[in-house]
């Protein structure tokens, strides 16, 4: 014998009050898949939350964060403040990038400048808080005589802090 | 799989204590520090405190020191929040989180898995 609740599609559930009779959810309230005995209620988006996308019958409200923060956690279940370049969040707080490092983002870590001299570089351009340095041509590339064409080095992730 | 449980929050009256305990499953309990977090309705996440895999070493941030204990029972796979004299400012939603290496401390979030949150009302 099929169960007559299996008939109720998604928006609806089946009321067994009302002899199983499907009935629409409630507002603020949704189901997003057949036969269902009971509607969830629809996630609110309030505070440091904002709705990005309305609740309907059929699927819930989806929420992001308020500008000065960023989602955490699946389907955004948080919002973690935002810092400003050249910071990083620790667990008291935005703090400026230790020397010898840099933030470029408003969010994520500190990181190492590139160390220059592991591919035989020289610093062209000073790193600060908020950009890494940038490596220039090696001396060798500077003596009279060499070719004026080097081949690039290969990219590599931001090394040690320059002895 | 690895997950997080949160569990014991509820309404309680200004002044009063609630636990907080969060399960754990799917990775090696004792190996990781465990962090509390919180999520206060207006604002963002808030470090509350964090306990090294052996819980020898324990760190608390200054808005919760001396109210709140946190501790673990690596046998029973478990993480503990002990909060007395509650104030309004402590309602909020509470996250455990697993961290990324067995120490941990102070500064760097070192999070890889969040619980899905209990919430703790404080009511005057």
């Known amino acids: 014998l099929q169960d007559p609740c299996s008939n109720c599609p998604a928006g609806t559930f089946c009321d067994n009050n009302r002899n199983q009779i499907c009935s629409p959810c409630p507002p603020n309230s949704f189901s997003s898949a057949g036969g269902q005995r009971t509607c969830d209620i629809c996630r609110q988006c309030k505070g440091v939350f904002r709705t990005r996308k309305e609740c309907s019958s059929t699927s819930n409200a989806e929420c992001d964060c308020t500008p000065g923060f960023h989602c955490l956690g699946a389907g955004c279940s948080m919002c973690e403040q935002d810092c400003k370049q050249g910071q990083e969040l620790t667990k008291k707080g935005c703090k400026d990038c230790c020397f010898g490092t840099f933030n470029d983002q408003k969010r994520g870590i500190c990181r190492p400048w590139t160390n220059c001299s592991l591919d035989g570089k020289s610093v062209l351009v000073n790193g600060t808080k908020e950009r890494d340095v940038v490596c220039g041509p090696s001396p060798a590339d500077l003596s009279p005589g060499a070719s004026s064409v080097t081949p690039p080095a290969p990219a590599r992730e931001p090394g040690h802090s320059p002895q | 799989e690895v997950q997080l449980l949160e569990s014991g929050g509820g309404l309680v009256q200004l002044g009063g204590s609630l636990r907080l305990s969060c399960a754990a499953s799917?990775?090696?309990?004792?190996?990781?520090?465990m962090t509390w977090v919180r999520q206060a309705p207006e604002k963002g996440l808030e470090w509350v405190s964090s306990?090294?895999?052996?819980?020898?070493?324990?760190y608390y941030a200054d808005s919760v020191k001396g109210r709140f204990t946190i501790s673990r029972d690596n046998s029973k796979n478990t993480l503990y929040l002990q909060m007395n004299s509650l104030r309004a400012e402590d309602t909020a939603v509470y996250y455990c989180?697993?961290?990324?290496?067995?120490?941990?401390?102070?500064?760097?979030?070192?999070?890889?898995?969040w619980g899905q949150g209990t919430t703790v009302t404080v009511s005057s």
């Open positions: 989180a697993k961290e990324r290496t067995g120490t941990t401390g102070d500064y760097y979030y070192n999070v890889d898995v």
């Open positions: 306990i090294s895999g052996s819980g020898g070493n324990t």
């Open positions: 799917g990775f090696t309990f004792s190996s990781y520090a």
